[in-house]
Interface confidence: low
């Protein structure tokens, strides 16, 4: 009679993560008597997957009833497959021996490849806010996918970005892979409502990419513009001066009025109006009693926005002239070193 052969008909098997893998194995003879064992890998470091004779293998079931005397089908099913299960599986026939069974013949092996979906991309932006015209970096990460071939794209408000670099790790063979991409985005004044999207396409997603998003509202800081104007007289000796704080984001803003360098009033922006582009406007006013001043008054509106150095704008109030004759003098000036912070 011809010597027993162990046949593994499938050179390779491809299974999606979470599914069940069927590894087929048949013997060509009932002789010699002895059990079958399944191993992952070959050589001394091989891992026992199933032993017909003894042991507890909760994820493994046999395809046929191995207790039947004439059974020659030793195929197994492995449930709930993960990328860590990838490898080459060998069906090995043992010959009954004393005290131990002796390995008799091995199948050629079946390579189990696992298709695993990438995790949802996580997009993260810079730790600190940045102002328009600055370039900021966003990173996108997705993990746990297999096979290695993957496509990643970046979009800003639906427009594809080109300034990015992507790495897939590890470079060599692995049970699963990770992708890491860094994109550079130039901020504009209109970006409060903008979104950056990282899109990952993989064979396991069947053409429906995964997306991760970041809102630029968490990244951008739009500094305010200031305008100080003198309003028409409210009373004989009173002048109303307003400070218009325009186009700022985020809302966190504190305003201080100074009269000739002395603090007159400090307030925090509360009732703001929102512009279409997501930025805010706010107005503060100061009522100045002209009769209390002998000389000209320098009124300064000083704004501290989102913890940044204060910016200010001043207005000279001439007290020599009668208030009614001043009209709407708007000869305002930027204060020295803060000029660069004014947009």
């Amino acid at each position: 009679e011809e010597e027993l052969q162990v046949i593994q008909p499938d050179k390779s098997v491809l299974v999606a993560a979470g599914e069940t893998a069927t590894l087929r194995c048949t013997a060509t003879s009932l002789i010699p008597v002895g059990p079958i064992q399944w191993f992952r890998g070959a050589g001394p470091g091989r891992e026992l997957i199933y032993n017909q004779k003894e042991g507890h293998f909760p994820r493994v079931t046999t395809v046929s009833d191995l207790t039947k005397r004439n059974n020659m089908d030793f195929s197994i099913r492995i449930g709930n497959i993960t990328p860590a299960d990838a490898g080459t599986y060998y069906c090995v026939k043992f010959r009954k021996g004393s005290p131990d069974d002796v390995e008799f013949k091995s199948g050629a092996g079946t390579e189990l490849s696992v298709r695993a979906k990438p995790s949802a991309p996580v997009v993260s932006g810079p730790a600190a806010r940045a102002t328009p015209q600055h370039t900021v970096s966003f990173t996108c990460e997705s993990h746990g996918f297999s096979p290695r071939d993957i496509t990643l794209k970046w979009f800003k408000n639906g427009n594809e970005l080109s300034d990015f670099q992507t790495n897939v790790d590890p470079v060599g063979e692995s049970v699963s892979y990770s992708i890491h991409s860094t994109a550079k985005v130039v901020l504009t004044r209109e970006d409060v409502h903008s979104q950056v999207i990282c899109e990952v396409a993989h064979v396991t997603l069947q053409g429906d990419p995964l997306r991760g998003t970041a809102n630029l509202s968490e990244t951008i800081r739009v500094p305010p513009t200031l305008e100080v104007t003198q309003q028409p007289v409210r009373a004989e000796n009173q002048v109303n001066v307003t400070c218009q704080v325009r186009k700022f984001y985020p809302q966190r803003l504190q305003l201080t009025w100074l009269e000739n360098g002395n603090v007159s009033r400090t307030e925090t922006a509360s009732t703001v109006t929102e512009n279409k582009d997501g930025t805010y406007n706010w107005m503060s006013w100061l009522l100045v009693n002209v009769s209390a001043h002998r000389d000209d008054v320098k009124l300064t509106c000083q704004v501290e926005h989102d913890g940044q150095p204060a910016v200010s704008k001043s207005h000279d109030l001439k007290v020599s002239a009668h208030p009614k004759e001043q009209g709407s003098n708007t000869a305002a000036e930027n204060t020295g070193s803060n000029e660069r912070n004014i947009y």
Partner: antibody, heavy 121, light 107 residues
Amino acid sequence: QIQLVQSGPELKKPGETVKISCKASGYTFTNYGMHWVKQAPGKDLKWMGWINTYTGEPTNADDFKGRFAFSLETSDRTAFLQINNLKNEDTATYFCARGHHYGNYAWFAYWGQGTLVTVSA
Amino acid sequence: DIVMTQSHKFMSTSVGDRVSITCKASQDVSLAVAWYQQKPGQSPKVLIYWASTRHTGVPDRFAGSGSGTDYTLTISSVQAEDLALYYCQQHYSTPWTFGGGTKLEIN
């Protein structure tokens, strides 16, 4: 259009140093890795390593560790290969090549014209 | 390292003929194979990547096929300008390795 223009041929003595440049144009330089490939006379192509043009991180193949250095001048969109302590077996044409832009998958869509380095006493 | 073997150093063909250049990897490279054409005194030009994807501008007479360890570059109707060296390269894992090349000669 996309171009990689390499510096001219070099004749060096054993023990000397050579630095080859590769200037890129027609694309965003920091989006694509720059690879270096050696072709000795009558021999096949051998990948030497690459440099990440965004982070500046070089990766040398095992056979090209020690005497071989990859560097960048990003503002000038130029990559460099420097070979120290030249040996006769370094005689070859050296190519820079732009890697495919999805991560580390490395096939090479665009190549420089090659720089012939001859090492002879 | 993955070894890429091009068993034919030379192949002779005639204009209009169909020719197949083969490449064998020392292990499964999961379709991560590129093919290059190098003409005398020139740098290599990529023809195919991911085993069968033609690079932009490559004539459709060039086709790549294969899986596992065995890959083929086929020129369906050889033209005189196809006289060149052809290299395969695996882009599966570093170090990226090339085959020894196959020189296509026109009768």
